[in-house]
């Protein structure tokens, strides 16, 4: 019977393949008259089309390179493999999709490079003193995680030009602390002090040699320094086969792109290395601060994880920055930097506990959708990251690549890589839009009315001015008797009133709105449903009245996302395990649960069990969450110590549990009207009396 392949009025093999991935073309010259050449493959076989004459390319994926994943990161670093496979080739026919998968492993004992980038403005004087022995302490702590550590050091203040620096009295140029009756270094933009080295005592020695400077305005020029520390890989000494941590410490806000105009600097940051032989940033006074976008691009290119170690007063600002820069973590630095060691170790733990995929150079005609298999072999649709991992864990992602239409260029490649990893998967795509039979085309063929067309794939492709199955009809020979071949049924309008009937064939009108196609001009690419003013919600293509949704979108209007990352709660479960994810939003099913991810539920039976772990780690510094350095991620609650529990009404749940000392801990889980979660914990656990 009729199907999508037979009703679109296609006249060539290439057009047939573009109708739908289900369509096949028969180039057999002996195909019975009246049988459609474009049809489902099984129908063509039924119509006695010779199997070797059927064009039916199938989308395929094949692995080109697949070294197995490594267990250890030590040894010959060039042989360490954290991503498998390393290369695949896809062959996609128009509007089709193909699945492939990628595995990622956080290998044990992977080399680590830590570059400490410090704000040396005047307010950081006590911090400089605090980190004098950081090198050896860091090496001791990190030895538990890697046998191959290198550390380096760099410092920044701000652009040494007015209005960022003191220029009067003249003495302030050489000593910006002149008016404070003390001495400090002349101001500098960024200086590289110590190239990454495994001699950790060198770090201590170099830090001891440093002194602070002073700048005039509140924000610092730290982003200039981040950019240079990122792109000057040879200067810094970043190794190809190592985790790269860039620790950025400051107690102040930072200048960003366009702030340079205050000093008349209009040249945009070029993202290149400008650290000269004197190890100073030479373009500090001639080039603007970098934008967040440029920094993100370069950090990603160089596989660097940025750690913002910043004081309480600016932590919210840097938290916002970190959300815009993948692979970035934020820690609260004490006023004198005394906690920076723990902060680096925690940040490294956080980085290694997460795998997040990023895609580079994805062609616009392709869309990808991801499914993650993180822990417990549970497949999470729409997710391209895994959290809560331990070193040595392996996670996998299933990826569907879908092509829209047939791209002009028949070859494209893109890369999928975990943020901060050097390893990647290269995906090479060949768009298979042509038919093999096209290679045997006969131009000016005698089979097409003595040369009026090209005989290709079993049919004539007519030259200009000629129509008909054998190019036998000139456009000038308009014969009304053939009008009935231009409408599907008697009484129906000719060419759907959107074309001219010439030689028994519809020649569709051109339209400003789009393309009119089909045997009877019955199809177009502009008459689909609109949602919020956009056809197919802006998330799909209109094809003969139907929305063909991009990947990640579904529904009649393509207005429902299939992505689920917005439904992921902090405990790593979709909708906290209390609801289902529909169109990117949680629909809470468990009675009493609410919140964007159904995370709030004081009356749920599991509330006490889960919140108990938060009490253990937040109040008593122990328990399962404490070990994993995940307390702050999972427990957003405020903790208040109380002498005894009060009755706070029906929205409060009283909980008790026995801790590891066999003492009874009592606490109350309460959410106030603003949705803030508070845990009231009885100060003293009730412990059993010892024998008299």
């Amino acid at each position: 019977g009729p199907n999508i392949c037979t009703t679109r009025g296609v006249s060539s093999c290439q057009q047939c393949l573009a109708v739908s991935p289900m369509c096949a073309w028969c180039s057999d010259e002996a195909l019975p008259l009246g049988s459609p050449r474009c049809d489902l493959k099984e129908n063509l076989l039924k119509d006695n089309c010779a199997p070797e004459s059927i064009e039916f390319p199938v989308s395929e994926a094949r692995v080109l390179e697949d070294r197995p994943l490594s267990d250890k990161g030590s040894g010959d670093s060039s042989q360490v493999t954290q991503v498998s496979p390393q290369r695949i080739a896809l062959r996609l026919r128009p509007d089709d999709s193909k699945n492939f998968s990628i595995q990622v492993r956080q290998v044990e004992d992977y080399p680590v490079d830590i570059y400490y980038l410090m704000d040396l403005s005047y307010s950081m004087k006590d911090d400089l003193w605090s980190i004098q022995n950081l090198g050896t302490k860091l090496a001791t702590q990190m030895r538990k995680l890697t046998s191959n550590l290198r550390i380096g050091f760099g410092a920044f203040v701000d652009k040494p030009v007015s209005p960022y620096m003191y220029i009067s009295p003249p003495e302030a140029l050489e000593n910006p602390c002149y008016d404070m009756k003390t001495t400090c270094l002349p101001m500098f933009g960024y200086k590289h002090v110590l190239t990454l080295t495994d001699q950790v005592t060198r770090f201590n020695e170099e830090v001891k040699k440093q002194s602070v400077s002073r700048n005039r305005d509140a924000p610092e020029g730290g982003f200039d320094a981040i950019m240079q520390a990122t792109v000057c890989d040879e200067k810094i000494g970043w190794r190809n086969d190592a985790s790269h941590l860039l620790v950025f410490t400051t107690d102040a806000k930072t200048h960003i792109a366009l702030d340079g105009r205050l000093a008349g600097i209009v040249q945009p940051n070029d993202g290149q290395c400008h650290v000269g032989s004197d190890n100073h940033y030479s373009a500090s006074t001639t080039m603007d601060y970098p934008s967040l976008g440029l920094m993100t691009e370069k950090l990603s290119q160089k596989n660097i994880n940025l750690i913002f170690a910043v004081t309480e007063n600016v932590v919210n600002l840097y938290q916002n920055y970190s959300e815009l820069i993948p692979g970035t973590t934020v820690g609260v630095l004490s006023m004198d930097s005394s906690n920076v060691l723990q902060l680096i170790v925690d940040a490294y733990g956080k980085i290694r506990s997460k795998v997040e995929l990023e895609v580079r150079d994805l062609p616009e005609e392709l869309s990808l959708s991801f499914n993650a298999t993180c822990l417990n072999n549970e497949v999470i649709p729409g997710l391209k990251s895994c959290m809560g991992l331990k070193i040595g864990d392996t996670v996998s992602f299933s990826i569907e690549a879908k092509v829209r239409g047939c791209p002009q260029e028949k070859e494209k490649s893109f890369t999928i890589k975990p943020v901060g990893f050097k390893d990647s998967l290269i995906v090479q795509v060949t768009f298979d839009c042509d038919c093999a039979c096209q290679a045997q085309a006969e131009p000016n063929s005698h089979r097409c009315n003595n040369g009026n067309g090209t005989f290709e794939c079993g049919v004539c492709r007519c030259g200009p001015g000629w129509l008909g199955s054998q190019c036998e009809c000139s456009e000038e020979d308009y014969r009304p008797s053939q009008q009935d071949e231009c409408s599907p049924r008697e009484g129906q309008p000719v060419c759907s009133q959107r074309g001219e009937c010439l030689c028994g064939q519809c020649v569709c009108h051109s339209s400003d709105f789009g393309k009119i196609t089909g045997k009877y001009c019955e199809c177009d690419d502009f008459s689909c449903v609109r949602y919020k003013g956009e056809m197919c919600s802006g998330h799909g293509q209109c094809s003969c009245g139907d929305c063909l949704c991009d990947s990640d979108w579904t529904g009649y209007y393509c207005n429902c996302t299939t992505r689920t990352d917005t439904c992921m709660s902090s405990n790593g479960l979709l909708c906290s395990g209390r609801g289902k994810c529909e169109c990117g939003s949680c629909v809470c099913i468990q009675p009493g649960s609410y919140g964007d991810t159904c995370e709030k539920c004081p009356t749920c039976p599991d509330a006490c069990t889960f919140k108990k772990e938060c009490v253990e780690c937040k109040k008593f510094d122990r328990g399962a969450l404490h070990d994993e350095n995940t307390c702050n991620r999972y427990c957003r609650d405020e903790i208040e110590s109380v002498k005894e529990l009060k009755d706070t009404g029906k929205d409060a749940v009283n909980c008790t549990y026995k801790n590891e000392d066999d003492c009874v801990v009592r606490f109350q889980y309460y959410e106030d009207s603003s949705g803030k979660s508070i845990l009231y914990v009885v100060e003293e656990p009730e412990c059993p009396k010892g024998p008299d």
Epitope: A89, R91, D361, E409, E411
Partner: antibody, heavy 119, light 107 residues
Framework: QVQLQQSGAELTKPGASVKISCKAT????????IEWVKQRPGHGLEWIGE????????KYNDKFKGKATFTADTSSNTAYMQLSSLTSEDSAVYSC????????????WGQGTSVTVSS | DIQMTQTTSSLSASLGDRVTISCRAS??????LNWYQQKPDGTVKLLIY???RLHSGVPSRFSGSGSGTDYSLTISNLEQEDIATYFC?????????FGGGTKLEIK
């Protein structure tokens, strides 16, 4: 139509370096991998490696690591191969070719550049 | 690496003959076999890819077949312009490797 035009023959001394160019026309240069192939009489064809001009990603045959270096300039649609520390073993004809990725077939070839290493 | 062997290094035939050139792989290459023609002046052209698909502009007298480890190129009606060396190449796994070539001459 697609064309790959290579630079002219090179005569060079042992220990020196040489840089061969391959200018592409007739297609979007950045989208297709460029392959480099070595041909010596009696040794057949050997794949040296490849570069994706748009992103600069390279892949080398283990045998040619440290010997060949690929670069590409998308503004001039030109791919380059530098051969270093030349010896008589490097005397050969070097060709660039465009790749159809899925089949790993090289559909268009440059005319070849002859490199002769002689003291 | 996969080894590609063209056992016949040279072959003589008359114009109009049907000529078959063979190529063997050291392991199964799943039909990812390509054929190239190198003319005496050194220019190289792709003839057939994926065992049997004709590259655009290649005359239909050229055809390819085979599977697993054994493949062949056939010229059904030899013409003067077909005088060249023919190479096979596997594209199944990296690195791609070539056969030693078969030189076709006129008797």
């Amino acid at each position: 139509q697609v064309q790959l035009q290579q630079s002219g023959a090179e005569l060079t001394k042992p220990g020196a370096s040489v840089k061969i160019s391959c200018k592409a026309t007739g297609y979007t240069f950045s989208s297709y991998w460029i392959e480099w192939v070595k041909q010596r009489p009696g040794h057949g064809l050997e794949w040296i490696g490849e570069i994706l001009p748009g992103s600069g990603i390279t892949k080398y045959n283990d045998k040619f690591k440290g010997k060949a270096t690929f670069t590409a300039d998308t503004s001039s649609n030109t791919a380059y191969m530098q051969l270093s520390s030349l010896t008589s073993e490097d005397s050969a004809v070097y060709s660039c070719a465009r790749l159809i990725s899925y089949y790993y077939a090289m559909d268009y070839w440059g005319q070849g550049t002859s490199v002769t290493v002689s003291s | 690496d996969i080894q590609m062997t063209q056992t016949t290094s040279s072959l003589s035939a008359s114009l109009g003959d049907r000529v078959t050139i063979s190529c063997r792989a050291s392991q199964d290459i799943s039909n990812y076999l390509n054929w190239y023609q190198q003319k005496p002046d050194g220019t190289v052209k792709l003839l057939i890819y994926y065992t049997s698909r004709l590259h655009s502009g290649v005359p239909s007298r050229f055809s390819g077949s085979g599977s697993g480890t054994d493949y062949s190129l056939t010229i059904s009606n030899l013409e003067q312009e077909d005088i060249a060396t023919y190479f096979c190449q596997q594209g199944n796994t990296l690195p791609p490797t070539f056969g030693g070539g078969t030189k076709l001459e006129i008797k």
